[in-house]
Interface confidence: low
């Protein structure tokens, strides 16, 4: 004979647990129905009546099967440096992620609590490690023979052009200037751009970074004049 189907509320066998989407109500000492996502318990069960569920009100939600007396409040609206990647509905909280050019400096269970602008490497410094969703750009001084003349969160140090005759030698922040009109460098001129991080949970393919001398620490510091050795800007 098939096992008898028990309808909620029912008293569980000693030592057994309630079934999926049921909970044990300690007051009634019965297994009772949980409320579905998007609902909450309006009236708790008794020995003779099951849980009465009701829909969550506007701007509140429950994400799981539950028996909470009130739905949870959705988080506050996304700030100007964020984009709303998931709206507040009766079944899910609002999720805010950082907009392009920013990274998440303080995350929360889902989404981001505090976004900060990606560091920009100053002239003489290039990107050693690109920014991601959750980490800032790391800058490094351009090594001898390379330069960066931009303030950028994506540009890396590029090799100096090789001149037949050098008019002005290159340095960390300036390319060499040739007297000849035909430099021998085979690389195409112009800045090399790294891909901007996107605010989704995608895989980032990144070049292997060199050891960095510019740690990512300045996102909350007030922006005053800073020594050139730091190699980054806050704007």
């Amino acid at each position: 004979l098939p096992a008898q189907v028990a309808f909620t509320p029912y008293a569980p066998e000693p030592g057994s647990t309630c079934r999926l989407r049921e909970y044990y109500d300690q007051t009634a000492q019965m297994c009772c129905s949980k409320c579905s996502p998007g609902q909450h318990a309006k009236v708790f069960c008794t020995k003779t009546s099951d849980t009465v569920c009701d829909s969550c009100e506007d701007s509140t939600y429950t994400q799981l099967w539950n028996w909470v007396p009130e739905c949870l409040s959705c988080g506050s609206r996304c700030s100007s440096d964020q984009v709303e990647t998931q709206a507040c509905t009766r079944e899910q909280n609002r999720i805010c992620t950082c907009r392009p050019g920013w990274y998440c400096a303080l995350s929360k269970q889902e989404g981001c609590r505090l976004c900060a602008p990606l560091r920009k490497c100053r002239p003489g410094f290039g990107v050693a490690r690109p920014g991601t969703e959750t980490s800032d750009v790391v800058c490094k001084p351009c090594a001898p023979g390379t330069f960066s003349n931009t303030t950028s969160s994506t540009d890396i140090c590029r090799p100096h052009q090789i001149c037949n005759v050098v008019a002005i030698p290159g340095n960390a922040s300036m390319d060499a200037v040739c007297t000849s009109t035909s430099p021998t460098r085979s690389m195409a001129p112009g800045a090399v751009h790294l891909p901007q991080p996107v605010s989704t949970r995608s895989q980032h393919t990144q070049p292997t970074p060199e050891p960095s001398t510019a740690p990512s620490t300045s996102f909350l510091l007030p922006m005053g004049p800073s020594p050139p050795a730091e190699g980054s800007t806050g704007d």
Epitope: T17, C18, E22, Y23, Y24, D25, Q26, T27, C32, K34, F44, Q63, L64, W65, N66, W67, V68, P69, L72, Q109
Partner: nanobody, 124 residues
């Protein structure tokens, strides 16, 4: 398989302390409220402490407020109950239980998984 295993119970003198542990397996603590309940001989089971899975907020029954502290270590998938200033009326079998994501009060209001319990005896 979902399991909760309590440990740390035993005999303690009045005024003494104990730390109960509840090791969870088969699920991650992050997404559930966890609670401690107790049942004294000849009495109904009562909820005494709950910790929420959503934000870690805690709730205690009046009878243990200021003496018992519930905590969790998600990395170890374990819930703890620190019990201080124990009195003979705290003698009971202590059960660990799982609720949904949220607590509402010390009793969880219900539970869907619970352990077999650990006996705490307070006596001189």
């Amino acid at each position: 398989q979902l399991r909760l295993v309590e440990s740390g119970g035993g005999l303690v003198q009045p005024g003494g302390s104990l730390r109960l542990s509840c090791a969870a397996s088969g699920f991650s603590l992050d997404y559930y409220s966890m609670g401690w309940l107790r049942q004294a001989p000849g009495k109904e089971r009562e909820g005494i402490s709950c910790i929420s899975g959503s934000d870690g907020s805690t709730y205690n029954a009046d009878s243990v407020e200021g003496r018992f502290t519930i905590s969790r270590d998600n990395a170890k998938n374990t819930v703890y109950l620190e019990m201080a200033s124990l009195q003979p009326e705290d003698t009971a079998v202590y059960y660990c239980a799982r609720g949904t994501l949220y607590c509402f009060g010390p009793s969880l209001g219900g539970m869907d998984v619970w352990g077999k319990g650990t006996l705490v005896t307070v006596s001189s």
